[in-house]
């Protein structure tokens, strides 16, 4: 956090995670200043000479930008006056992980804050009833994870039960040779029960729920990024 006072403004960053191969956002906010031309935003990365991005006098200045970020960054220009200095990052790579600094200078003063950016892969799981199996089973699939996650099953009826003996999990490397497809099969399931497939690594936690009854199958999935926040 920046130090409040005559020459310092408060700058706030949020630890966030990037999904490789997709757009990412490095979040940073500051005390707003209506004088756009007086606002300078600089993004720096620890261990990198040159800037990640610079925005000043109402426009981008990439004259000092490091080559690894060329054509991959942009601020949300229309939101700068309201105190948004967040950076959009194109095609997130594993090598983008690290410590970033959001440095702000306005007519009110200056300030900076650090941000820890994690990169990996995470995706929503989908659970389906596997009718091909000899006994009723559930198949939980998630297309992209990295680093390799842990997979656990739970059930509403048998709370606290250990399903490791009646499940089989495999990790299949995807075509880009980094991320992996996660497939987990749970055997001997009973109807009128809700089962959960939980996939977790140090970046994200995803849960897929399925409720199987005589008349219908209900599904729900959710994804939560870990350690994200100020």
């Amino acid at each position: 956090f920046g130090i409040s006072g005559k020459h310092f403004i408060t700058v706030t960053t949020f630890t966030s995670a990037g999904n490789i191969g997709e757009d990412g956002t490095l979040s940073c906010t500051f005390e707003p200043d209506i004088k756009l031309n007086g606002i300078v935003i600089q993004w720096l990365k620890e261990g990198i000479k040159g800037l990640v991005h610079e925005f000043k006098e109402g426009k981008d200045d990439l004259s000092q930008q490091h080559e690894m970020f060329r054509g991959r960054t942009a601020v949300f220009a229309d939101q700068v006056v309201v105190g948004n200095a967040s950076l959009r990052l194109k095609n997130v790579q594993l090598t983008d992980a690290g410590t970033y600094t959001c440095y702000i200078r306005t007519s009110k003063g200056k300030g900076n804050a650090n941000l820890e950016y994690k990169t990996g892969a995470f995706s929503m799981p989908e659970i389906n009833v596997d009718y091909n199996a000899s006994s009723e089973s559930l198949r939980c699939e998630a297309p992209r994870w990295f680093p390799q996650p842990t997979v656990a099953w739970a059930s509403q009826v048998d709370q606290g039960a250990n399903f490791s003996e009646v499940s089989n999990t495999s990790f299949e490397l995807n075509s880009e040779n980094v991320t992996m497809k996660v497939v987990s099969v749970l055997y001997n399931v009973t109807i009128n029960n809700t089962y959960s497939c939980m996939i977790e690594n140090d970046i994200a936690k995803a849960t897929g729920d399925i409720k199987v009854t005589d008349s219908e199958v209900k599904r729900r999935s959710q994804l939560q990024l870990l350690n994200s926040g100020p």
Epitope: I20, G21, E22, D23, H53, K59, D60, D61, L62, S63, Q65, R70, G71, R72, T73, A74, A77, R88, K90, N91, R144, N174, S175, E176, T179
Partner: antibody
Framework: EVQLVQSGAEVKKPGASVKVSCKAS????????IGWVRQAPGQGLEWIGD????????NYNEKFKGRVTITRDTSTSTAYLELSSLRSEDTAVYYC??????????????WGQGTLVTVSS | DIQMTQSPSSLSASVGDRVTITCKAS??????VAWYQQKPGKAPKLLIY???TLQPGVPSRFSGSGSGRDYTLTISSLQPEDFATYYC?????????FGQGTKVEIK
């Protein structure tokens, strides 16, 4: 409204060079990448390269390296494509296009009307 | 460099048909695939970017999907004005690349 207006048709002899211009208006010229794409008669689209007018940074298709130069003049908000050592297979319509996303190189969202370059002896 | 292999190269369809065009990337994973429509003598028009985001003003019968190396453009109910050539574009790599194009003709 974003507008890209290209220079007129050109007829060139094999071995010569051609320089096609693309004048931009309706947005901040230095803030968005501009790309060049060509299309030979009856053929598909082929990406040539692009430039960031705010810094003059360029990217080129390996196929054209050494023969193509993309430049810009910020005072007139104009981008240029120069292709040298022309051969008959360079006969095509050449398009300029603005890339979406400002300093972020996005997809091409606004296009010029195209410039026909004919290479013939 | 990432190449895009588009199929089919041409197809015949009738008004009201559901049409699907695919592009396969030679390597890697990224969501940076756009789709363009081009009519004879005209510049290409952006329909979809970032795999599935519809460009403003483009009818909702156009949709994009895909993951990994496989990407798809779908026209849910073909209209007379949709007969044209369609191209995919890979723009995640430093070097951009178009697919070879798919000509959609009237059956």
């Amino acid at each position: 409204e974003v507008q890209l207006v290209q220079s007129g048709a050109e007829v060139k002899k094999p071995g010569a060079s051609v320089k096609v211009s693309c004048k931009a208006s309706g947005y901040t010229f230095t803030s968005y990448w501009i790309g060049w794409v060509r299309q030979a008669p009856g053929q598909g689209l082929e990406w040539i390269g692009d430039i960031y007018p705010g810094g003059g940074y360029t990217n080129y298709n390996e196929k054209f390296k050494g023969r193509v130069t993309i430049t810009r003049d910020t005072s007139t908000s104009t981008a240029y494509l120069e292709l040298s050592s022309l051969r008959s297979e360079d006969t095509a319509v050449y398009y300029c296009a603005r890339l979406d996303g400002s300093s972020y190189r996005g997809a091409m969202d606004s296009w010029g009307q195209g410039t026909l370059v004919t290479v013939s002896s | 460099d990432i190449q895009m292999t588009q199929s089919p190269s041409s197809l015949s369809a009738s008004v009201g048909d559901r049409v699907t065009i695919t592009c396969k990337a030679s390597q890697g994973f990224n969501k940076y695939v756009a789709w363009y429509q081009q009519k004879p003598g005209k510049a290409p028009k952006l329909l979809i970017y970032y795999t599935s985001t519809l460009q403003p003003g483009v009818p909702s019968r156009f949709s994009g999907s895909g993951s990994g190396r496989d990407y798809t453009l779908t026209i849910s109910s073909l209209q007379p004005e949709d007969f044209a050539t369609y191209y995919c574009l890979q723009y995640g790599d430093l070097l951009y690349a178009f697919g070879q194009g798919t000509k959609v003709e009237i059956k």
